[in-house]
């Protein structure tokens, strides 16, 4: 008789999850020689320990604390790029601008990017069939709690000028319910962070509006200002040109507004 298994509304654990995490860890330490001494088997053991045998709707930040002990990776605190609903462009940017870092450029972010995982209460099995959906099932699931935890720590580490890339094509350019809006904004440390600079990325080629005047951006400015952090905003009208100019800043066409 097959054992009853909880059916969740979200997709199950990414196939070959343990192998993927371990392989990503090894690859990361090869790409980043400053992490060459990291023992990836220990990293996987700590990752696994955070959710295996635990109810996937009862995960806490505490469960991830052993893994977070590895999160002391020294990313320059003044070179942090946050993003909301525009991950691909943010990653393309840091691939070119190598001295800036998104959360997914750190080891823990790199390990988990685009993956799903959950376990089952009281068994050592990984659930490859289904995992809790944040909206339909529960918010305290292994994936959501992981990203909340690492995002909070990433924001807490930031200093000086922090940049955030926002998607100007969305109805809510700044969304209070996003990870950026609900976690990162509130964990920037005013005693360390001088300015939050928003880059609003335009979608349409003919879109010449000043999206920095959008009501949701004004809302972000208000939240940030109340936290004693300065706010500035720039329109990125041509994201393709923007990336090109990051690659070749000396190009004569890069002096005009992008």
């Amino acid at each position: 008789v097959p054992r009853w298994r909880q059916q969740w509304s979200g997709p199950g654990t990414t196939k070959r999850f343990p192998e993927t995490v371990l392989a990503r860890c090894v690859k990361y330490t090869e790409i980043h020689p400053e992490m060459r001494h990291v023992d990836c088997q220990s990293v996987w053991d700590a990752f696994k320990g955070a959710f295996i045998s635990k109810h996937p709707c009862n995960i806490t930040e505490e469960d991830y604390q052993p893994l977070m002990k590895l999160g002391t990776q020294t990313v320059p605190c003044n070179k942090i790029l946050l993003w909301s609903r525009i991950k691909d462009l943010a990653h393309q940017f840091t691939q070119v601008q190598r001295d800036m870092f998104t959360l997914e450029d750190t080891l823990l972010g790199y390990l988990a990017d685009d993956l799903t995982w959950c376990g089952e209460f009281n068994t050592s099995k990984i659930n490859y069939q289904s995992c809790p959906d944040w909206r339909k099932d529960c918010s305290n699931n292994p994936v959501s709690v992981f990203w909340k935890t690492v995002s909070r720590r990433f924001a807490e580490a930031a200093c000086d000028v922090v940049h955030v890339m926002l998607n100007g094509s969305r109805s809510k350019i700044f969304d209070k319910n996003s990870t950026f809006g609900s976690v990162e904004v509130h964990n920037l440390q005013p005693e360390k962070v001088q300015t939050l600079e928003a880059w609003v990325i335009h979608g349409g080629r003919e879109d010449s509006r000043d999206l920095c005047q959008d009501p949701t951006i004004k809302e972000l400015e208000s939240i940030i200002s109340k936290r004693n952090i300065q706010f500035s905003c720039k329109n990125i009208y041509r994201p393709d040109k923007f990336l090109q100019c990051v690659k070749n800043p000396e190009d004569s066409s890069c002096t005009s507004e992008i």
Epitope: P33, E34, R36, H37, V38, D39, S42, V43, T72, T74
Partner: antibody, heavy 118, light 111 residues
């Protein structure tokens, strides 16, 4: 075969300066992280500093940070340790070491003795 | 006071097995590789074990390393007189952003 030869040790007064050198051969020097490790008389091994390959990043033990500077000259296959504001507790044999791909110290020099005494 | 703790001495008769422990924390051994070095007085230290349990070529298989949690150990089986030396464990430490060594264990071969 890999050879690391330290030089520049000697007797120096407290507060004085000394510059250690390490001549490397037998491997592609510019590819590897390099380190200095020391052993005080009757004590154990103590890591002092490391320098990365590529655009160099430097790492220091708390006990020497701000006083010692590690540097490298890839054209000369040489590693250096500039030691300023020396103290009696810096007296030790200083070893130059090459780091492997997993952070291990794969090859060591024979060491050079630094004595800080008035 | 070393960040990694080792017993000051260990001994055994020729042919015996000796184990040296090395305990640390999650900021060093917990998430990082452990390395073991053999140091004979007046000579350069020699790498015995890297990546917790790997032996460089030329190191006899009498030497073996292991790691569990925040601790590691080095085992020497078939002890020989030439194994008389100081043995050091080492690991990277995140909180110090540098390497830490154990205080060293002097191994003596009796009889």
């Amino acid at each position: 075969q890999v050879q690391l030869v330290e030089s520049g040790g000697g007797l120096v007064k407290p507060g004085g300066s000394l510059r250690l050198s390490c001549a490397a051969s037998g491997f592609t020097f510019s590819d590897d992280y390099m380190s200095w490790i020391r052993q005080a008389p009757g004590k154990g091994l103590e890591w002092v500093a490391s320098v990365s390959n590529g655009r160099p990043t430097t790492y220091y033990a708390d006990s020497v940070r701000g006083r010692f500077t590690i540097s490298r000259d890839n054209a000369k296959n040489s590693l250096y340790l500039q030691m300023n504001s020396l103290r009696a507790e810096d007296t030790a044999v200083y070893y130059c070491a090459r780091e492997g791909w997993s952070g291990e110290f794969t090859d060591w020099g024979q060491g050079t003795l630094v004595t800080v005494s008035s | 006071q070393s960040a990694l703790t080792q017993p000051p001495s260990a001994s055994g008769t020729s042919g015996q097995r000796v184990t040296i422990s090395c305990s640390g924390s999650s900021s060093n051994i917990g998430f990082h590789f452990v390395y073991w070095y053999q140091h004979l007085p007046g000579t350069a230290p020699k790498l015995l074990i890297y990546k917790n349990n790997q032996r460089p070529s030329g190191v006899p298989d009498r030497f073996s390393g292991s790691k569990s949690g925040n601790s590691a150990s080095l085992a020497i089986s078939g002890l020989r007189s030439e194994d008389e030396a100081d043995y050091y464990c080492a690991a990277w430490d995140d909180s110090l952003s540098g390497y830490v060594f154990g205080s060293g264990t002097k191994v003596t071969v009796l009889g």
